[in-house]
């Protein structure tokens, strides 16, 4: 039964298990064709060079291939994500192939013995795809496999082992122990595809990451930042999941890569963004919303091919359930002046106010300290397509850093009463929004008013497109 | 059409084996996983486990361990339970039923029971 | 473990009257959009028999009189108009992706 620390504890656990304990059961690998999107249909079973099945089965030869690859499980069944998926490519390609690779018997194992099997999966694949290859028109480009967790590994050793090149893989969150930092023929890697995509969903620094944390594609996609996922906390567990523990805030997060490639085939409409960064900080300071030389790419299914670069780490904000689409801004506010600030850090939230809808009141997550005299910029996201925006409305609370910087504001007060209050000076945000690329720039509403209190509030209006400023007299450092 | 027909009913002596079977007609037997569940006189329904009836490896639940075996002979497309050592509390009636392994594993055909009796 | 309290225990229903189980969920049987709660129907002697799947989906076959409704952890199986051949016990039970899949209790349903 789970350890008290769920998959991370029982992984752990598995990891340490003595061989002895591993079942005898007869290797595996069944090639199931979805023939119907009922799921409890139960398919045609592929057998590699008998060719009745193909017929039998419909199997399209021009069509394309989808070959859906699980993971490492505990217990033995088929998942209801997996469903889920079929569903969804049948939906999205009417004409598509959709196979489901079976290895369970070999899955159903200590996790290491599991890990052991994956390149023996992934060679049954490949001798299948060879098989097909040699049939008329069938086009191994037009191959897509689509690996989950353990899975996308065995999707790289079957690119890896087949004979020529598939069209492309797609890794939803890898698995992480025993791939992390391996050799790239031993992993999932941008090698074993025309095109490697990959979402990271369940990945950290600290403790056991159930996903890889490392890049293995040519674009590797973090939402939110590739590990705590909204609506996977352990309150909205508890409330509206099964089991309601640990266990299940993993699956969630882990499962979480799978619910947004979903996502991607049947919300077509409302496609998500991701956005090329370096690392999740500068993502979340709100630095990284260029579309410029492929910086930014749908995600998921959608996701256009970039090979002219290797290991693209992609960032992006997401609801926590679909269709998972958000609206992201770059908002750049400059502080001109702080005025009897003491060691207050403040601590910014907006509303935004556009053509369609209106924002909630927004916190700006701060990153680092926000700078006085600077620029200082920031990431924020909508649920909502507001349209084009018209206002902002901004206010400031201050975030003492310590107890004792509170302290020192309180016996400061006490001392001086008079003291005039602490204030901010701002004449002006400039946004970009990541969905559209466009820039806007909000003057405050009164010029000759732009210092703003604690719990005041101040209203900035679209005063221009772009951000260039002219006849512009500032006494600081200006944007470029 | 679609059956599970099961074993008759057997009388046995605590501390026997007893072993019941369940074979499958009306479609392919290793496309389907097998449960079973056992129904104690006047009681409700309580899941035992099931087999993948294609790699032959078997699930229990926590109260079902150790005693008791699930097996297979795929040729015979039939599943066995067998209950080692039997107890007076394994009277009961027991039913082999099937779920599909790609949708949302309801059980949608059952074996019609066989009711095992402990003789004193 | 998942465990489902069903309620009443027994009830008595006149011919073309409306039915009402219960059965509750000691946790959420949800799963991205759907609920994973079926319903069973027993008559003494016979095995049981599939009447809904997924809260509310009807197994082909079984008439339109039985309908389920539900998510999270409170699910409903009604019969109407209640007809003779409905005296039976029904259960509930959760099938979501970690056995063990555990069945309620029972309620057992007597015609007037």
């Known amino acids: 039964s789970p350890t008290p620390f769920g998959p991370e504890g029982q992984l752990a656990d598995e990891l340490h298990k003595p061989k002895a304990i591993q079942t005898e059961v007869k290797p595996s690998v069944r090639f199931n064709l979805r023939t119907s999107k009922d799921p409890e249909h139960e398919g045609c079973y592929l057998s590699l060079g008998h060719s009745q099945p193909l017929e039998d089965c419909g199997f399209n030869m021009t069509a394309k291939t989808f070959f859906i690859i699980h993971g490492w499980t505990m217990s033995g069944i088929f998942e209801n994500w997996l469903h889920k998926l079929v569903s969804a490519l049948h939906t999205r390609e009417k004409d598509a192939n959709v196979v489901v690779v079976d290895w369970l018997p070999l899955a159903h194992q200590l996790y290491t013995d599991a890990v052991n099997n994956t390149r023996v999966v992934g060679h049954s694949i490949a001798r299948m795809l060879d098989w097909l290859q040699e049939k008329d028109d069938f086009s191994l480009g037009n191959v897509h496999l689509i690996g989950y967790s353990l899975g996308a590994h065995v999707a790289g050793y079957a690119g890896n082992f087949v004979k020529g090149t598939v069209g492309r893989i797609t890794g939803l969150d890898p698995a992480g122990p025993m791939f992390e930092g391996a050799d790239i023929h031993k992993r999932l890697s941008p090698d074993d595809a025309d095109f490697v995509d990959v979402l990271h969903t369940y990945t950290r620094s600290f403790g056991l990451s159930i996903g890889i944390q490392m890049p293995v594609g040519h674009i590797d996609i973090y939402p939110n930042g590739g590990d705590f996922q909204p609506g996977c906390g352990l309150n909205d567990v508890l409330g509206s999941m099964a089991y309601g523990t640990i266990t299940e805030v993993v699956k969630c997060e882990h499962e979480r890569a799978v619910h947004l490639f979903v996502d991607s085939l049947v919300n077509q409409d409302k496609p998500s963004f991701a956005f090329q960064c370096t690392d999740s900080n500068r993502f979340k300071k709100g630095i990284c919303l260029s579309c410029r030389k492929n910086r930014c790419n749908s995600i998921g299914y959608n996701a256009k091919k970039m090979r002219n670069k290797r290991n693209s780490k992609m960032y992006l904000k997401t609801r926590a359930g679909m269709p998972f689409r958000v609206y992201h801004y770059q908002m750049k506010i400059h502080v001109f002046s702080y005025k009897n600030m003491g060691e207050i850090e403040p601590t910014f939230y907006v509303t935004l106010y556009g053509t369609n809808a209106d924002s909630q009141t927004l916190p700006l997550e701060i990153v680092e300290r926000i700078e006085q005299n600077a620029t200082n910029t920031f990431l924020v996201y909508t649920e909502e397509d507001l349209g084009d925006l018209l206002k902002i409305q901004l206010t400031w609370e201050g975030a003492s850093q310590s107890w004792y910087n509170l302290w020192k504001e309180l016996r400061s007060y006490l001392s001086q009463p008079h003291n005039p209050g602490r204030e901010l000076n701002i004449r002006r945000i400039r946004v970009k929004s990541g969905e559209t690329q466009r820039k806007l720039t909000f003057c405050a509403e009164d010029p000759e008013n732009t210092s703003i209190s604690p719990g005041r509030e101040l209203w900035f209006r679209k005063c221009r497109d772009g951000w260039r400023m002219k006849n512009e007299t500032s006494p600081t450092v200006e944007l470029p | 059409q679609i059956q599970l027909v099961q074993s008759g009913p057997e009388l046995k002596k605590p501390g026997e084996t007893v072993k019941i079977s369940c074979k499958a007609s009306g479609y392919t037997f290793t496309n389907y996983g097998m449960n079973w569940v056992k129904q104690a006189p006047g009681k409700g329904l309580k899941w035992m486990g099931w087999i993948n009836t294609y790699s032959g490896v078997p699930t229990y639940a926590d109260d079902f361990k150790g005693r008791f075996a699930f097996s297979l002979e795929t040729s015979a497309s039939t599943a066995y339970l067998q209950i080692n050592n039997f107890k007076n509390e394994d009277t009961a009636t027991y039913f082999c039923?099937?779920?599909?392994?790609?949708?949302?594993?309801?059980?949608?055909?059952w074996g019609q029971g066989t009711a095992l009796t402990a003789s004193s | 473990d998942i465990v489902l309290t069903q309620s009443p225990a027994s009830l008595a229903v006149s011919l073309g009257q409306r039915a009402t189980i219960s059965c509750k969920a000691s946790?959420?049987?949800?799963?991205?959009?759907?609920?994973?709660m079926n319903w069973y129907q027993q008559k003494p002697g016979q095995p049981p028999k599939l009447l809904i799947y997924?809260?509310?989906n009807l197994k082909s076959g079984i008439p339109a009189r039985f309908s389920g409704s539900g998510s999270g952890t409170d699910f409903t199986l009604n019969i109407h108009p209640v007809e003779e051949e409905d005296a039976a016990t029904y259960y509930c039970q959760q099938t979501t992706d970690d056995p063990p899949w555990t069945f309620g209790g029972g309620t057992k349903l007597e015609i007037k």
């Open positions: 946790q959420s049987v949800d799963y991205d959009g759907d609920s994973y």
């Open positions: 997924a809260a509310s």
């Open positions: 039923a099937r779920f599909s392994y790609y949708g949302r594993h309801y059980f949608d055909y």
